[in-house]
């Protein structure tokens, strides 16, 4: 089955610059399919923009300004790129790549979409580091004792732009856990968001990870925030693993004598 | 030009109570096109639900039913037993791929219908209230309450800033909420909640324990701990980025 990944969840540009949005195709040979690009402007319907067919033919929607969009594909990396020239505020939108995928039954096809990339235009000079800054909250003793469950909370602050994705996993597992989150909130010129995960008592002795995707993450990779195992009988960090690490790889643990 | 027009911009649904979305086609006969339905959830993920010819996306066949009313020129999508996972914006779209003759392989979309999911009516449930702390940050966790109406108060004489609470549906079909704030005196912050004309305090849930039960660190003790495993995370979180871990004792 075809799968589309758009690695950039957002792309922030200043006016008149060029934006390049990527779409990675897997599960199907890119040179054997057509890739379509759609945009969803705020308050408008999702609109077809341009497509590139298996033989490289480009088709643009009528009424789309000439010279504004360019589409290509790179078979070696199985990638299609949408280039938006001379960005202006009317280009603010979420851009989706899509492709027709054949179903098992002959003649049945569906169009699958990538997760989208939001194009953001700014005229602000922001601080050098506008990646999400995490703060972690561990379960309260009251919750673990009374409810035989514990809630981890992952707070992310001082990031720009506002587009962010958060999910949770147990260590050594790729299963995404069911979590809950608040709305993204504006604080001065940046944003904050929090997500929380409630796990049953039997999972409290496992390490959990809050995984954050953001345009300005260091080196462009997902940020993983580690939540240590919790002992419900003795609240301390699990010392069983003793890997040596660089000093700058450590987390600072503040043990405070607080109630609740 | 073809236009697809949803019947409603917003449709509130209750968990487990069937709901119907409708989308009419203007300017053309709906029978000349294939109708598709998509759902966009938080984070912009566009998921395929249904396409004419009885094609359903993975996991949708049991809980969704697509239909066309040729006489009324409209498409219908039924959500048979909505759950909180079904919240999102639903889009109808049309194409003529595979119809032969004049065909379009692009999709023409209508505007979205926002489906909001509410728990079904149920007996009132009092919340549990817990406080979590880290440095100047305090979170008040309010669990498993019904109905939704609630006021969460973080009690402190030295507030730096507070944020609007997040109120969401819990997996059990009630509500959970979290309110966050920053306080100079975070150690003394408690949380009180007004719900159903009653007040619930976080202190009501504090556990009285023997000193043997827990590690009791010295007030000022800060320790550096190695990371828990040899696995190198994709992005290392440095100490300046994590406002410390807080073990509440």
């Amino acid at each position: 089955a075809g799968h589309l990944e758009q690695p950039q969840i957002s792309s922030t540009k200043t006016l008149s610059k060029t934006a390049r949005l990527e779409c990675v195709v897997s599960g199907i040979t890119i040179s054997a399919t057509s890739v379509y690009w759609y945009r969803e402007r705020p308050g408008e319907v999702i609109q077809f923009l341009v497509s590139i067919s298996y033989d490289g033919t480009v088709r643009k929607e009528s009424g789309i300004p000439s010279g504004k969009f360019e589409v290509d594909r790179i078979p070696e990396t199985s990638t299609s790129t949408l280039t938006i020239h001379n960005v202006e505020k009317q280009d603010i939108a979420t851009y989706y790549c899509a492709l027709w995928e054949a179903q098992q039954e002959l003649g049945k096809k569906i169009k699958v979409f990538g997760p989208g990339t939001k194009l953001i235009i700014t005229d602000k000079q922001l601080d050098a580091d506008v990646s999400p800054k995490p703060t972690i909250f561990l379960p309260s003793i009251a919750e673990t004792k009374l409810q035989k469950a514990g809630t981890y909370l992952c707070l992310l602050e001082k990031f720009f732009p506002d587009v962010i994705k958060i999910h949770w996993q147990e260590k050594k597992s790729n299963t995404i856990l069911g979590s809950q989150e608040g709305n993204t909130m504006k604080t001065n010129d940046t944003y904050m968001k929090f997500s929380w995960l409630t796990v049953p008592e039997k999972s409290l002795d496992k390490e959990h990870r809050c995984i954050v995707r953001h345009e300005n993450n260091k080196n462009g990779v997902d940020q993983e925030i580690i939540f240590p195992p919790i002992k419900t009988d003795v609240i301390t960090m699990d010392p069983k693993d003793n890997c040596s690490k660089d000093a700058n790889d450590t987390l600072l643990l503040q043990l405070t004598n607080t109630s609740a | 030009a073809i236009e697809l027009v949803p019947e409603h911009q917003t449709v509130p649904v209750s968990i487990g109570v069937p709901a119907t979305l409708r989308c009419s086609m203007k300017g053309e006969a709906i029978g000349n096109y294939y109708i598709n339905w998509y759902r966009k959830t938080q984070g912009n993920t566009m998921t395929f639900i249904y396409r004419e010819k009885d094609i359903y996306g993975p996991g949708f066949k049991d809980n969704f039913q697509g239909d066309i009313d040729i006489a009324k020129n409209l498409a219908v999508l039924k959500i048979l037993a909505p759950s909180e996972r079904d919240e999102g914006s639903y889009y109808c779209a049309c194409d003529t791929l595979g119809m032969g003759g004049e065909y379009t392989d692009k999709l023409i979309f209508g505007k979205g219908t926002r489906v909001t999911v509410e728990p079904r009516s149920q007996p009132h449930t009092k919340p549990s209230v817990f406080v979590m702390k880290n440095g100047t940050n305090v979170a008040c966790l309010v669990k498993e309450f019904y109905p939704k109406d609630i006021r969460i108060n973080l009690v402190s004489s030295k507030k730096i800033t507070e944020f609007d609470p997040a109120i969401v549906i819990s997996p059990s079909g009630k509500y959970n909420a979290v309110k966050l704030g920053k306080y100079e005196d975070s150690n003394s912050v408690t949380c009180s909640v007004q719900h159903d004309n009653k007040t619930v305090h976080s202190t009501d849930f504090e556990v009285k324990t023997d000193s043997t039960d827990h590690v009791k660190p010295k007030e000022t003790e800060n320790t550096k701990q190695p990371s828990k495993s040899c696995h190198k995370p994709k992005a290392i979180v440095h100490t300046e980025k994590v406002n410390m871990m807080s073990l509440t004792v």
Epitope: G43, E88, Q90, I121 | -
Partner: antibody, heavy 122, light 106 residues
């Protein structure tokens, strides 16, 4: 000081043409979406047309679509409105207005010209 | 097509609070703004993006927006505030103005 000065208005017969100009000064013209708004005598404001910063996008009110053409010359700091097939109901004061929202998906007009009167009458 | 509705006229005594409403479908999502226009003059922006005030606009002007209604509030209304007021929003590829409200200061 931001200034927008319209010119080119006047009396024209139904079916005739007119070209309005707007000279901008006191700000960097090129990044801004520019607009024409009109006001018939004794009536309210009616948006006519918008043009994006690099002329990629032009939008028109239904009432003028196919008859009016908006354009701009960033080198000359100028905005234009070519009005063809004029009708009596096009009689109005035409204002040139700057869109104050440079980078957001909203529109508000933070500076307006003094307006130029277009009268369509036989 | 999208429409914004305003009352044709509102009267207020000097020093009192004047409220002018503007209603339209899902207006809360559309960032309403407000203009003041005095006879023979060009419009002046007084509120944008629901509740922001351009520099030079007195603090007595404020805006709010929720659901289907945007409201322009003038607290401590002065005689000089007598004018026509227009709300405006943006829908899809169209800019829409309300019909205007004549504010009379008695």
């Amino acid at each position: 000081e931001v200034q927008l000065v319209e010119s080119g208005g006047g009396l024209v017969k139904p079916g005739g043409s007119l070209r309005l100009s707007c000279a901008a000064s006191g700000f960097t013209f090129s990044p801004y979406t520019m607009n024409w708004v009109r006001q018939a005598p004794g009536k309210g404001l009616e948006w006519v047309s918008s043009i994006s910063s690099s002329s990629s996008y032009m939008y028109y009110a239904d009432s003028v679509k196919g008859r009016f053409t908006i354009s701009r010359d960033n080198a000359k700091n100028s905005l234009y409105l070519q009005m063809n097939s004029l009708r009596a109901e096009d009689t109005a004061v035409y204002y040139c207005a700057r869109d104050g929202d440079l980078v957001g998906p909203t529109y508000y007009f933070d500076y307006w010209g003094q307006g130029t009167l277009v009268t369509v009458s036989s | 097509s999208y429409e914004l509705m305003q009352p044709p006229s509102v009267s207020v005594s000097p020093g009192q609070t004047a409220s002018i409403t503007c209603s339209g479908d899902k207006l809360g999502d559309k960032y309403a703004c407000w203009y003041q226009q005095k006879p023979g003059q060009s419009p002046v922006l007084v509120i944008y993006q629901h509740n922001k005030r351009p520099s030079g606009i007195p603090e007595r002007f404020s805006g709010s927006n929720s659901g289907k209604t945007a409201t322009l509030t003038i607290s401590g209304t002065q005689a000089m505030d007598e004018a026509d007021y227009y709300c405006q929003a943006w829908d899809s590829t169209t800019v829409v103005f309300g019909g205007g409200t004549k504010l009379t200061v008695l």
